[in-house]
């Protein structure tokens, strides 16, 4: 008769490497008498005999994982006990190996030149895959702009036109290689004018060709504006080559004008625009223009840029030595004075001052400025800036302002033409909304159209200083 013998594990468990979806087997050879009861644990948790993912054979000495999963990683132990002596245990690790897999592949990207592009490439695998990128047929080299991130994503700073192309990411480890689908990086470029139209001084009745060249991705469209309106006469010829558009406007010249070339292209829902302008003057007209009180030109200043109509011609008074600089200096001074007025008054006063100093202009033999309509001037005085005006007039009457100290270019309302006379004799300015809570004796009018923005400035009782020489009556 055999003597009882405590269990001894003769084949200790070893580390097992297994690929996902493959079979992994742990062998736990035990010598003992009587035959031991063998149980298995994974990460100290008992593996149930009826778990269909496992097969336990050879009296419990063989544990087979039938289809390895990523989550099966861990420490597996066999415990043998036959009631003689203590239980014995042996442990070994299961390392789940995995061929590279791309879990978040890159997608097609459209990006504007100069911005940052990120092409994702998230991977799985054991050992951890290394990620590289291919552009076209060549391996992509990293540099100061181009980097492969820890996550595997490709980051391109300050995207350039030459970055456009087809990309794929490659995930590689000792078990294999995975490739993503090819994706396209498209680089869009804002419209830019390469060649601006040139100004011309010609004789009456001449033909002139204005040429404007622009580039961009997508290829821009070019339109022409004459004195702020769409060109009404003349012929336009266009050609496109290598993303460059060339537009030629041929004109029969019977009057001087300001011609603006506008290049536009679309980026998603947004548009980019580039402009260049040229003047066409008539040689014989220069004498009569010198005799007049001023000239018409596009406003090129900054202060009134947001207030004046885009591309409109305004009147510059040649009684100043340098009209454009002088008028801009005047409005700049006025603007600083306006910083102290109420949020209700400020946009109205800004519009009034800009349109009074830079009046709409009709080019002709004698350029003619068009003053603001009296009604708008009165609206500013009595609705929007009533408090400021009262304070200003009170100070003026008490002699607080000496002539020339704070000369704001404020019109005298009563001297302005009325919109009810000749509708072409004055400029009707856009409607400004005014609210009842700010005004005691005037009606509240609510506009469904966007009204002029009223900046969120602190309310102030200080007025904007105006010389009595420019009273508003």
């Amino acid at each position: 008769e055999k003597l009882p013998k405590a269990p001894v594990i003769t084949t200790p468990l070893e580390t097992v490497d297994a690929l996902v979806e493959e079979v992994a087997t742990f062998m736990c050879a035990v010598e003992s008498y009587p035959q031991p009861e063998i149980s298995w644990t994974r990460n100290k948790i008992l593996i149930k005999l009826f778990d269909t993912r496992y097969s336990i054979r050879e009296n419990g000495q063989l544990l087979t994982i039938l289809s390895v999963e990523d989550s099966d990683d861990g420490i597996y132990c066999c415990i043998a006990n036959n009631g003689v002596g203590g239980a014995v245990e042996s442990c070994g690790a299961l390392q789940v190996k995995m061929k590279p897999k791309i879990t978040r592949p890159p997608i097609n990207v459209k990006i504007i030149e100069g911005l940052k592009a990120v092409l994702p490439c998230t991977t799985m695998g054991n050992p951890k895959p290394s990620v590289s990128w291919i552009k076209g047929d060549n391996a992509l080299r990293e540099n100061s702009r181009i980097a492969v991130l820890e996550s595997g994503s490709l980051r391109i700073h300050n995207v350039q036109k030459e970055d456009a192309g087809q990309y794929r990411c490659v995930a590689k480890n000792s078990l294999g290689t995975a490739y993503s689908k090819l994706v396209k990086l498209e680089v869009e470029v804002f419209a830019r004018i390469l060649r601006a139209p040139e100004s011309h001084n010609v004789t009456f009745g001449s033909f002139v060709t204005l040429r404007c060249t622009a580039i961009g991705i997508p290829v821009p469209t070019i339109s022409w504006i004459e004195n702020g309106n769409a060109v009404s006469s003349g012929s336009i010829q266009e050609s496109v080559k290598d993303r460059v558009i060339d537009s030629r406007l041929q004109l029969f010249i019977t009057k001087p004008g300001l011609y603006t070339c506008i290049a536009t292209n679309k980026h998603g829902e947004k548009f980019s625009t580039a402009k260049a302008a040229a003047t066409v003057s008539i040689a014989e007209w220069s004498k009569s223009q010198k005799d007049s009180q001023g000239y018409c030109a596009q406003y090129r200043g900054e202060v009134c840029d947001a207030v004046l109509a885009k591309d409109a011609l305004v009147f510059f008074n040649t009684s100043y030595r340098d009209p454009e600089d002088a008028q801009e200096l005047l409005i700049h001074t006025a603007w600083n004075e306006l910083k102290a007025v109420s949020p209700l008054c400020r946009p109205a006063a800004e519009a009034l001052l800009c349109n009074h100093l830079f009046q709409e202009c009709s080019p002709g033999v004698v350029p003619t400025p068009m003053p603001i309509c009296r009604e708008y001037c009165l609206a500013v005085k009595e609705l929007f800036c009533a408090k400021e005006w009262q304070a200003m007039e009170g100070k003026a009457h008490r002699g607080l302002y000496r002539s020339g100290m704070h000369l704001l270019p404020v019109p005298e309302c009563s001297k302005l033409p009325s919109m009810h006379r000749d509708p072409t004799a004055c400029t009707r300015l856009p409607y400004l909304d005014y609210k009842k809570e700010n005004i005691t004796t005037f009606p509240s009018i609510t506009s469904s159209r966007p009204s002029a923005d009223i900046p969120n400035l602190p309310a102030s009782t200080s007025s904007f200083a105006v010389s009595p020489a420019y009273s508003m009556t």
């Epitope: 109509a309 709409e360 009604e375 708008y376 009165l378 609206a379 005085k381 009595e382 609705l383 009563s414 009325s418 919109m419 009810h420 006379r421 509708p423 400029t427 009707r428 300015l429 856009p430 409607y431 004796t441 005037f442 009606p443 009018i445 469904s448 159209r449």
Partner: antibody
Amino acid sequence: EVQLVQSGAEVKKPGESLKISCKGSGYSFTSYWIGWVRQMPGKGLEWMGIIYPGDSDTRYSPSFQGQVTISADKSISTAYLQWSSLKASDTAMYYCARHSHWGFLDYWGQGTLVTVSS
Amino acid sequence: DIVMTQSPLSLPVIPGEPASISCRSSQSLLQSNGYNYLDWYLQKPGQSPQLLIYLGSNRASGVPDRFSGSGSGTDFTLKISRVEAEDVGVYYCMQVQQTPYTFGQGTKLEIK
């Protein structure tokens, strides 16, 4: 509160003269144009003309030029519409209304009914 | 003179239903400032006219939002999204682009 209050109804004979009034209050009377509008019995609105009380500048519709006179007395904030010789065809409701600084008629008087009948 | 033409001249409407009035001018009422100098007025029975819409599409103070104005240049529309009994009266369009200012003939809105 802005208000335009017109004078009461008038019954006149053909050939007589008449001056109806419109008194403004609650705003700067001299800074707004006042318009006159005629409405004949069962008919639509007709714009007659306007006055700027600040300097008594007037504009008339060609249909009413020479037929009526529009005037104003800024010292009492009142505008007037007058006839030197009424005709039966002048029978109508006459409204005064204030032209806002953007042109639209934002406040109206209650109307003056003028009846011309022999 | 600028001639204003309204249609229809009579408009019977069931309460709760929408209504639309058209106004056409013989010249463009669009100014260089982007605004159309056209206004809409309502004259309720026995009352003075009242301003509804100014500068083409702006609702006057106190006017319910079921009233809206649209259009540009020479063609304009006044819409009432759901007519109520209190909306009965005569609707007039008026141009204030140039003197003499002129009204349309009027559209009489009545409840069916």
